[in-house]
Amino acid sequence: KESCDVQLYIKRQSYHSIFAGDPFKLECPVKYCAHRPQVTWCKLNGTTCVKLEGRHTSWKQEKNLSFFILHFEPVLPSDNGSYRCSANFLSAIIESHSTTLYVTDVKSASERPSKDEMASRPWLLYS
């Protein structure tokens, strides 16, 4: 029998290599049964995850999953870092793994490096 617990499908150690100035949607895939939980995004600051208030978010519904989306319009250098989504369900908090955004400022890069280059070249990244 399928579990009816809320599950958040963000992979551990996942990352996205993105460029300042581009739009980007960070998705939190959510599986639930009857009632959609309340979901929030936060950004890690050391070991603390600071809730993101007043940001543009939306829901997208697919066949077996819903996606809680955090919109970056556009991506800023300061958006570099790790993010986590959390679901509030039956007064319990379910936390996802964190996912990291590696932001490259295209003004400082002569050409757009590949995703793997960005993830392995921290001097291209903003802290």
Epitope: Q7, K11, R12, Q13, S14, S17, H97, K115
Partner: antibody, heavy 119, light 112 residues
Framework: EVQLVESGGGLVQPGGSLKLSCATS????????IHWVRQASGKGLEWIGR????????KYAASFKGRATISADDSKNTAYLQLNSLKTEDTAVYYC????????????WGQGTLVTVSS | DVVMTQSPLSLPVTLGQPASISCRSS???????????LNWLQQRPGQSPRRLIY???KRDSGVPDRFSGSGSGTDFTLKISRVEAEDVGVYYC?????????FGQGTKLEIK
């Protein structure tokens, strides 16, 4: 039934290249990380790298960076390892392994494919 | 890189007796999510590796309950409460907290 089946091994000349395949079934490859690991005869396990078939992001061990390319085609539920500039020391059994990325719920290994680098 | 050190490297055991394998890492395997990503693999002779234990102590489905994992930080142990003939093979610890992921050298379990 869950299966990971590696293929593409065999005899390769030093300096040559190989491309190994790992055909998976019984789960959605996009929910996993695909690892490639090798084992020389009578030796231990050596991690080559890892691919996220959902987005193509890849990590490599330092000794394989620039020489190995790990990729996946989620439409075929298949992962690949390309290894260039082969040396005799690359002779080994090459395994793919698929580990669920969200909750660690499974970790499956293939049966391995033997690569022999020799002139 | 995180160095994984197993001991002993060879472990002769009498059938029905317990066995214990130690694995030490050169740095803590505690991830920032509060979990410790330490696996134990079994490789029987002529076969591919198989995951036995993940997250230090969680047994994979189909793994007999005579296998147990414990530990934290940098110090981990795999225990077999009563060794059976089918347990012969090489056991590896594997950390996937820090890149690059690394394996222990392996411990060869054989029957006395």
């Amino acid at each position: 039934e869950v299966q990971l089946v590696e293929s593409g091994g065999g005899l390769v000349q030093p300096g040559g290249s190989l491309k190994l395949s790992c055909a998976t079934s019984g789960f959605n490859i996009k929910d996993t990380y695909i690892h490639w690991v090798r084992q020389a005869s009578g030796k231990g396990l050596e991690w080559i790298g890892r691919n996220d078939p959902a987005n193509g992001n890849t990590k490599y061990a330092a000794s394989f960076k620039g020489r190995a390319t790990i990729s996946a085609d989620d439409s075929k539920n298949t992962a690949y390892l390309q290894l260039n500039s082969l040396k005799t020391e690359d002779t080994a059994v090459y395994y793919c392994a698929s580990y669920e990325g969200y909750y660690e719920r499974f970790g499956y290994w293939g049966q391995g494919t033997l690569v022999t680098v020799s002139s | 890189d995180v160095v994984m050190t197993q001991s002993p490297l060879s472990l002769p055991v009498t059938l029905g007796q317990p066995a214990s394998i130690s694995c030490r890492s050169s740095q803590s395997l505690l991830d920032r999510d509060g979990k410790t990503y330490l696996n134990w693999l079994q490789q029987r002779p002529g076969q591919s590796p198989r995951r036995l234990i993940y997250l230090v102590s969680k047994r994979d489905s189909g793994v007999p309950d005579r296998f147990s994992g414990s530990g934290s930080g940098t110090d981990f142990t795999l225990k077999i409460s009563r060794v059976e003939a089918e347990d012969v093979g090489v056991y590896y610890c594997w950390q996937d907290t820090h890149f690059p992921y690394t394996f222990g050298q392996g411990t060869k379990l054989e029957i006395k």
